[in-house]
């Protein structure tokens, strides 16, 4: 090998990567908030809705301080993968009923996928442990009725909103440690 010529900076520094990940998460949080408003407007919810297949909220914002970088990113990635799967399921299962939300749901899915890629890239650049995703869960059963699907949509968007809110806080905290 010859003398080291050096390389031009080809890609963002992990700290810059973290900044852009925070921006993407914030924009996804806003997308989710707007979609939730639209959904409530078109299909008013009667109270809170749950879906057993959704991940439980990773952590209260107050308990974030004790977390380590790898556990935050690993958990966040696992939860977001689950939400991506649920959004895909929702679009397939409820195509006609949720037609009015379709362009936005499609955008949400695309941005969620992009955020997952960013998180993985960040973990690679920092050389943090990358646990394999959980084994594929059994396919989600189609909703029993249109209203069942709408309740599921409320649960998915509500849970995703909470997770992304947690994610923004967590990523901002991690930035101070990097």
């Amino acid at each position: 090998p010859g003398p080291p010529p050096g390389s031009p900076r080809a890609s963002p520094d992990p700290r810059a990567e973290l900044d852009s990940t925070v921006l993407l998460t914030r924009s996804l949080l806003e997308d989710t908030r707007q979609l939730t408003i639209q959904l409530k407007d078109k299909f008013p919810a009667d109270g809170d809705h749950n879906l057993d297949s959704l991940p439980t909220l990773a952590m209260s914002a107050g308990a974030l301080g004790a977390l380590q970088l790898p556990s935050v990113l690993t958990r966040l990635r696992a939860d977001l993968l689950s939400y991506l799967r649920h959004v895909q399921w929702l679009r397939r299962a409820m195509g006609s009923s949720l037609k009015t939300l379709e362009p936005e749901l499609g955008t949400l899915q695309t941005r969620l996928d992009r955020l997952l890629r960013r998180l993985q890239l960040l973990m690679s650049r920092l050389a943090l442990p990358q646990l394999p995703p959980d084994p594929p869960a059994p396919p989600l059963a189609p909703p029993s009725s249109t209203w069942g699907g709408i309740r599921a949509a409320h649960a998915i968007l509500g849970g995703l909103h909470l997770t992304l809110d947690w994610a923004v806080r967590g990523l901002l905290l991690l930035k101070t440690r990097l």
Epitope: P14, R117, L121, R125, L126, P129, L178
Partner: antibody
Amino acid sequence: EVQLLESGGGLVQPGGSLRLSCAASGFTFSSYGMHWVRQAPGKGLEWVAVISYDGSYKYYADSVKGRFTISRDNSKNTLYLQMNSLRAEDTAVYYCAAGVPDYWGQGTLVTVSS
Amino acid sequence: QSVLTQPPSASGTPGQRVTISCSGSSSNIGSDYDVHWYQQLPGTAPKLLIYSNNERPSGVPDRFSGSKSGTSASLAISGLRSEDEADYYCSAWDSSLSGPVFGGGTKLTVL
């Protein structure tokens, strides 16, 4: 401009030891995970070891586990590879690389031969 | 034996489009881990060509593109040039090894 400069390679007898160093400049060394990757003459790339940005996580290829140790000194912007119990099959150009890896050094040749 | 499988060689004439494949398994590419591609010109160190399946680092021409599906990935080079003659390697994280794995490399010849 990003620079990774490896040193410490050379000729060593089987069973011997060698310590490679990699001096980094032009980027925030302490924000990057760092790798050692090797390439035997005329062969492909083989990942050797990785250390996380803060040194808290270290992983090794099975072929070097228990013989090689990766470490870093963020205050000196330097990565190290301590190689013990060297074998003929460890003969290769050893590259230090940062991130994905995004950046690579030019490599240092390690020859294990009697 | 490399963990990721690539064809040992590929070739094309100037201006042509060439594709190099990279096949993995459920512990690497199939586990939703991203694929990265490297170019190694004769006598030099590898250089990152594509990261995160299809992203190009600054300075890499848009003639180079990547894609991924299931447990495999591919690198496409369009408008082939003589300076593209090099070895190309794919790489992905492998959960069973807790580290990145590389393909065996593909030697691209521009005829």
